[in-house]
């Protein structure tokens, strides 16, 4: 599932190349392992912002699929309460390209620990 999430992120990156979306997104670029689920939640919430701002059907479907895949992969530990983690709004705002690169990094963390 996580490998498919990375495929979806690459697809989103390709799709937004042709668009001019100036959004800055809350981005966790240095994820601590004890906060990875919280960070993943922030990434997924921000991904929905990309979908809504783009107004593009393909991006919308890909984001929705990515959320479904991530949900299923995290169904066993998605409700773990992680303490001492940053709120999404406390994270640094970065452009979409940097956001997607950081997203791939956190997904790779999940792949490495699964």
């Amino acid at each position: 599932n996580w490998v498919n999430v990375i495929s979806d992120l690459k697809k989103i990156e390709d799709l937004i190349q042709s668009m001019h979306i100036d959004a800055t997104l809350y981005t966790e670029s240095d994820v601590h392992p004890s906060c990875k689920v919280t960070a993943m939640k922030c990434f997924l919430l921000e991904l929905q912002v990309i979908s809504l701002e783009s107004g593009d059907a393909s991006i919308h479907d890909t984001v929705e699929n990515l959320i479904i895949l991530a949900n299923n992969s995290l169904s066993s530990n998605g409700n773990v309460t992680e303490s001492g983690c940053k709120e999404c709004e406390e994270l640094e705002e970065k452009n979409i390209k940097e956001f997607l690169q950081s997203f791939v990094h956190i997904v790779q963390m999940f792949i490495n620990t699964s």
Epitope: M40, Q48, L52, D61, E64, I67, N71, L74, S75
Partner: antibody, heavy 122, light 112 residues
Framework: EVRLMASGGGLVQPGGSLRLSCAAS????????MSWVRQAPGKGLEWVAT????????YYPDSVKGRFTISRDNSKNTLYLQMNSLRAEDTAVYYC???????????????WGQGTLVTVSS | DVVMTQSPLSLPVTLGQPASISCRSS???????????LEWFQQRPGQSPRLLIY???NRFSGVPDRFSGSGSGTDFTLKISRVEAEDVGVYYC?????????FGQGTKLEIK
């Protein structure tokens, strides 16, 4: 008023195939994910398949995975369910349903068609 | 898979009296983004299912306000404040937080 009309049901032998259709009207079909749900005679509801708005992504339970294929033709406002290798336990009324988007805050099957009966028997 | 368990399976109610149906999931159905995708459907005899409640407590358009949904995590409830004759049928809870999406077994509401 949203309209969904399922058709294509009938009697088929075990191992056979059938294709169901669901004609949609009175809404912008391409803006919605769609699902199929079935109900065996006298039994409860079972989710069968879901397809994304553009048709690129599909989801199934293990009970039908590899045998059933959900697809759509947005130019014809029509949803399909191709059912292969049918078994007696696939006998049911099949309903098509419209899905509200997860991203716009819903993610629920808000409107349902009237259903079409599939009977698998020799 | 998430198993949805409803109780009671049969619910005889006097007209005008309240009714309550419970639905319990085998694991939390709060998804990673914090949403709980729990719906309630009504199926009247001989009819297609009809959406009543989505995301635990949101009433769908056209649904009378005597229907309400509540709950969180793994425990959910559908309440009818005053049962009317047209409420007869089977009620299903449904989770679509995690694939495969799953229904409860159904609760048959009948008039005493």
């Amino acid at each position: 008023e949203v309209r969904l009309m399922a058709s294509g049901g009938g009697l088929v032998q075990p191992g056979g195939s059938l294709r169901l259709s669901c004609a949609a009207s009175e809404f912008t079909f391409s803006n919605y994910a769609m699902s199929w749900v079935r109900q065996a005679p006298g039994k409860g509801l079972e989710w069968v398949a879901t397809i994304s708005r553009g048709g690129d992504y599909t989801y199934y339970p293990d009970s039908v995975k590899g045998r059933f294929t959900i697809s759509r033709d947005n130019s014809k406002n029509t949803l399909y369910l191709q059912m292969n290798s049918l078994r007696a336990e696939d006998t049911a009324v099949y309903y098509c349903a419209r899905r509200v988007s997860m991203i716009t805050g819903g993610w629920a099957m808000d409107y349902w068609g009237q259903g079409t009966l599939v009977t698998v028997s020799s | 898979d998430v198993v949805m368990t409803q109780s009671p399976l049969s619910l005889p109610v006097t007209l005008g009296q309240p009714a309550s149906i419970s639905c319990r999931s085998s694991q939390s159905i709060v998804d990673i983004t914090g949403n709980t995708y729990l719906e309630w459907f009504q199926q009247r005899p001989g009819q297609s299912p009809r959406l009543l409640i989505y995301k635990v407590f949101n009433r769908f358009s056209g649904v009378p306000d005597r229907f309400s949904g509540s709950g969180s995590g793994t425990d959910f409830t559908l309440k009818i404040s005053r049962v009317e004759a047209e409420d007869v049928g089977v009620y299903y809870c449904f989770q679509d937080s995690f694939v495969p999406y799953t229904f409860g077994q159904g609760t048959k509401l009948e008039i005493k």
